[in-house]
């Protein structure tokens, strides 16, 4: 007996071939011997089976001795043994119909769990193997669970259902609602304008919700809310903003914030949260601001950075076109009685310059 696997809602062709390539009498029945379809003259006739309105056959192939039955909009309960009677012989085809669906909405927040449930005919014992867009393999039986969705789980999941050495493939589109980056750091010289961008890792037709940016300045004892905003159909409107700093926010996506000036008292880290309508939980993105200041006071040339820096970052003071350099893995470096000329303050990570500020030292007579 031939086994054919089908997908719920899909269309399947059950083949039945006669030895002679000519038009001949045939009919298809189910396991209860109820006629589904057959031939009468050149006409396709339908029987009393509940399948009849979804069953068809291709007349153009009858001349080739092919008397297939096509079943549209498959249901789990269509799983059965079908019998094709042609040329005084019977061909049996066992059809097994499976369905694979996500238990919840397929738009899930990062960190939430995904459960895929397999619908299968009674008596079947299928196995399921799913592959995420990032190449992660998960196996299961009637259910497959992914406990904590990650950003890279967004996309098409390919699930293979196996039964009796046959396979059928399902594709399920999962959208993980998250920001493109978990964290980002902006490096600025004191006084420069600061741009914070929070691009989303997904697109939705309608995007509605509300958000807030909480900021923990390095110099402050507690965090404070810098801005709150609403999002309606991808349009951004500010609800409340602090007086200091006076942030500005773009009206369109991606979420975009502008801090007019980078000042040492603003250096620190923030957490932007976005709550989407009809979704439990929030999207998060951490953002850090590092501010550099180079100053000369009397005989002392100083370079300082404020904000969250890693201990492996190097701060250097260097005289342009000269070898004179002072470097430290610290947040401040200084030179006493600096030579006249253009000095560079550099914040670097393994040789890569993240931030630089120039200061001119004039000769003292």
């Amino acid at each position: 007996k031939k086994v054919v696997l089908g997908k719920k809602g899909d269309t399947v062709e059950l083949t039945c071939n006669a030895s002679q390539k000519k038009n001949t009498q045939f009919h298809w029945k189910n396991s209860n011997q109820i006629k589904i379809l057959g031939i009468q003259g050149l006409f396709l006739t339908k029987g009393p089976s509940k399948l009849s309105d979804r069953a068809d056959s291709r007349k153009s192939l009858w001349d080739q001795g092919c008397f297939s039955m096509i079943i549209k909009n498959l249901k789990i309960e269509d799983s059965d043994t079908y019998i094709c009677e042609v040329e005084n012989k019977k061909e049996e085809v066992e059809l097994l119909v499976f369905g694979l669906t996500a238990n919840s909405d397929t738009h899930l927040l990062e960190g939430q769990s995904l459960t895929l449930t397999l619908e299968s005919p009674p008596g079947s014992s299928p196995s399921v193997k799913c592959r995420s867009p990032g190449g992660k393999n998960i196996q299961g039986g009637r259910t497959i669970s992914v406990p904590q969705l990650e950003r890279q789980d967004s996309g098409t999941w390919t699930c293979t259902v196996s039964q009796d050495q046959k396979t059928v493939e399902f594709k399920i589109d999962i959208v993980v609602l998250a920001f493109q980056k978990a964290s980002s750091t902006v490096y600025k010289k004191e006084g420069e304008q600061v741009e914070f961008s929070f691009p989303l890792a997904f697109t939705l037709e309608k995007l509605t919700g509300s958000g807030e940016l909480w900021w923990q300045a390095e110099r402050a004892s507690s965090s404070k809310s810098w801005i709150t905003f609403d999002l309606k159909n991808k349009e951004v409107s500010v609800k409340r903003v602090t007086q200091d700093p006076k942030l500005q926010m773009g009206k369109k996506l991606p979420l975009h914030l502008t801090l007019p000036q980078a000042l040492p008292q603003y250096a620190g880290s923030g957490n932007l949260t976005l709550a989407l309508e009809a979704k439990t939980g929030k999207l998060h993105q951490e953002v850090n601001l590092v501010v550099m200041r180079a100053t000369q006071f009397q005989e002392n040339l100083t370079c300082e950075v404020w904000g969250p820096t890693s201990p492996k970052l190097t701060l250097s003071l260097k005289l342009e076109n000269k070898g004179a350099t002072v470097s430290k893995q610290a947040k401040a470096v200084w030179v006493l009685n600096p030579e006249a000329g253009m000095w560079q303050c550099l914040l670097s990570d393994s040789g890569q310059v993240l931030l630089e500020s120039n200061i001119k030292v004039v000769p003292t007579w």
Epitope: K7, T11, G41, K59, S60, D63, I70, K72
Partner: antibody
Amino acid sequence: QVQLQQWGAGLLKPSETLSLTCAVYGGSFSGYYWSWIRQPPGKGLEWIGEINHSGSTNYNPSLKSRVTISVDTSENQFSLKLNSVTAADTAVYYCARLVNWFDPWGQGTLVTVSS
Amino acid sequence: EIQMTQSPSSVSASVGDRVTITCRASQDISNWLAWYQQKPGKAPNLLIFAASSLQTGVPSRFSGSGSGTDFTLTISSLQPDDFATYYCQQANSFPYSFGQGTNLGIK
């Protein structure tokens, strides 16, 4: 709601190969047959050939020597190649789904063969 | 190969008229026949299949009849949206073939 979207080169020189692809969205790919039909400007419809998801093909004898229809089930797409084109192959080319009847159809692609 | 012949090649009619288009097959095709409507610059649209079955979403003013070699498409009361070209198609055997078309214009 199943939709067929087709694309390919619209301007060819004589003797070149016509190449078109049709993608199937929002519906079953297996179980159906997938056809190409053409319509010269101001004229009637001519069936070119068909393929199913397992790659079984049937072609119009008048074009069989020059036609290849292939399928990519992983992408739910099927393609048409017509070799050695001449001005007589200038037409709007349609893809369509069928069991016995053509429904639905792609939007059509005008292919012009001119030196 | 089965030849399909439509008549008339063109017909002019007014809104509200009853219009009949015929299609003849060169051999018996039982009821393996479909009718399509095509508007300029658009793909054909299935109206009738299996000679007399109305496709889902098609207005009931369209009807099909016939069997064997002679078939008819009838529009009971012509509407402004019905001015188009109509084709018949046989699905009895390869190669599938279409009639040459009937252009239905405004009188």
